[in-house]
Amino acid sequence: KNLKSPQKVEVDIIDDNFILRWNRSDESVGNVTFSFDYQKTGMDNWIKLSGCQNITSTKCNFSSLKLNVYEEIKLRIRAEKENTSSWYEVDSFTPFRKAQIGPPEVHLEAEDKAIVIHISPGTKDSVMWALDGLSFTYSLVIWKNSSGVEERIENIYSRHKIYKLSPETTYCLKVKAALLTSWKIGVYSPVHCIKTTVENELPPPENIEVSVQNQNYVLKWDYTYANMTFQVQWLHAFLKRNPGNHLYKWKQIPDCENVKTTQCVFPQNVFQKGIYLLRVQASDGNNTSFWSEEIKFDTEIQAFLLPPVFNIRSLSDSFHIYIGAPKQSGNTPVIQDYPLIYEIIFWENTSNAERKIIEKKTDVTVPNLKPLTVYCVKARAHTMDEKLNKSSVFSDAVCEKTKPGNTSK
């Protein structure tokens, strides 16, 4: 009886693992083995595919074959018993195009209200991704174990920190890789779960802001307790893409080591032009807080984001505020060619109760004021880019008295 060729050959490539699967053509014939040959583009001769000779099952692994993953290859298969079937040719394919990204390795570290995620490719020193290994981005799905409500986080790099979690709570997550340059989306990792730690005695500093005063940067933050010392560290933002690189080292700002106030001042020349990340940590001598959330700091925007100047026209029940371009030395206006929003704070001179207005326009009305009352106003500018989220310092306060009643027209 003539042996039939096997059919429906499937090639599965995940990272550097090359698997072939096929269907037997004739289930009734026993003791059949299968063998593959391969052929490279532009070659006439067929070569025996090592790892896929005289196979008794319907699956084989040819990962040991050192192929050029960008070069098209063709496969053929036949069945063998006493005689052999005719060859069945598989459509030619390019391994790189066919390959899927395997599940990444994931390592978790817990803080009280945050989880640090370390992600690395599932296959170390992969041949398939040798030219693309630095281009992987990752996405993850995270959920509280008790609720199962999922949150997706896209476009993260191989070290990512998730903040604003609850202490002593189990969170679960899974991660997959993507190579956006090749339109490839990978397979999810197994689910990893971790319990956040008991709440730390010292919370991390919050609301970190950078502003410019004279030739210095002023870094300010909020903290819950008094009598603390703080340290500030910085990192080149582009290194976030590549935390495995030896250059990924958080560095001290010398003028911000062991400061006893919730601000520190350091010269602008500490940073060359670029984008940096900053973080702050608190200590009381015995205990240390976790690091604050990292803020992005762009020297180009920061250097030129000056406080707005404004004029006030006083009426009996309101102020009209006209915001102009900030002045630099020499009294020339600064041209700021990115969209800004303005935060205007005002208060009655005899009170500490502040009110706030946020406006995109440069002419703003402050309503509901009392006649013949002194009110003070200060303003600052914010960039509208959420990621950079830069703010100028507040302008000096300007105080004006409202007019007597019936002058609101």
Epitope: L239, N245, L247, K249, Q252, P254
Partner: antibody, heavy 117, light 107 residues
């Protein structure tokens, strides 16, 4: 002004030990990697290893691992390269260089080590 | 170790010539690739960092390009002070490694 000042030339016999130094000034010493580079007579540059003085993280090139020791004393802003037993093949010019995201941006003047019986 | 291979290993050129030196890495190094110039008896000098950025004080006739595994240093118009040996260096993997050098000589 950033400066890296290396110790002076050395003439040694095979089997002797040696430590050469590189003192950094004009910058925050602990914020930069320090590299050691060998240049044998008439040859190219060879990376020996690097050290991050802040946490003493040290990485050696495979061909120098076990043959030399790189260390640093951050209290005096100085990095060291040492041999426990010199060989004639260690004869070379040795440079230290400050290393950061912009490459090896400042170099020492070099220390010539001659090993001869 | 990542191997860095420069070509050519030496070249002769005349003043005003455009000179191109290539460097190939055995693995992807992203854009973590630097170029140095060394003159006899002197310490090397950084020319280009992270593939295409001109180091401080380096003339604009020097430029760098490339990413991944293939990189190029170009001198647009060779000057007398440019005759030297040029090295590429990757810093994606620690410790950084150098190419074997390209000697640029006067024709």
């Amino acid at each position: 002004e950033v400066q890296l000042v290396q110790s002076g030339a050395e003439v040694k016999k095979p089997g002797e030990s040696l430590r050469i130094s590189c003192k950094g000034s004009g910058y925050t010493f602990t914020n930069y990697w320090m590299a050691w580079v060998r240049q044998m007579p008439g040859k190219g540059l060879e990376s020996m290893g690097i050290i991050y003085p802040s946490d003493s993280d040290t990485r050696y090139s495979p061909s120098f691992q076990g043959h030399v020791t790189i260390s640093a004393d951050k209290s005096i802003s100085t990095a060291y390269l040492q041999w426990s037993s010199l060989k004639a093949s260690d004869t070379a010019m040795y440079y230290c260089a400050r290393h950061d995201v912009e490459g090896y941006d400042y170099w020492g003047q070099g220390t010539l080590v001659t090993v001869s019986s | 170790d990542i191997q860095m291979t420069q070509s050519p290993s030496s070249l002769s050129a005349s003043l005003g010539d455009r000179v191109t030196i290539t460097c190939r890495a055995s693995q992807n190094v992203g854009n973590y690739l630097n170029w140095y110039q060394q003159k006899p008896g002197k310490a090397p000098k950084l020319l280009i960092y992270r593939a295409s950025n001109l180091a401080s004080g380096v003339p604009s006739r020097f430029s760098g390009s490339g990413s991944g595994t293939d990189f190029t240093l170009t001198i647009s118009s060779l000057q007398p002070e440019d005759f030297a040996t040029y090295y590429c260096q990757q810093m994606e993997h620690a410790p950084p490694t150098f190419g074997q050098g390209t000697k640029v000589e006067i024709k």
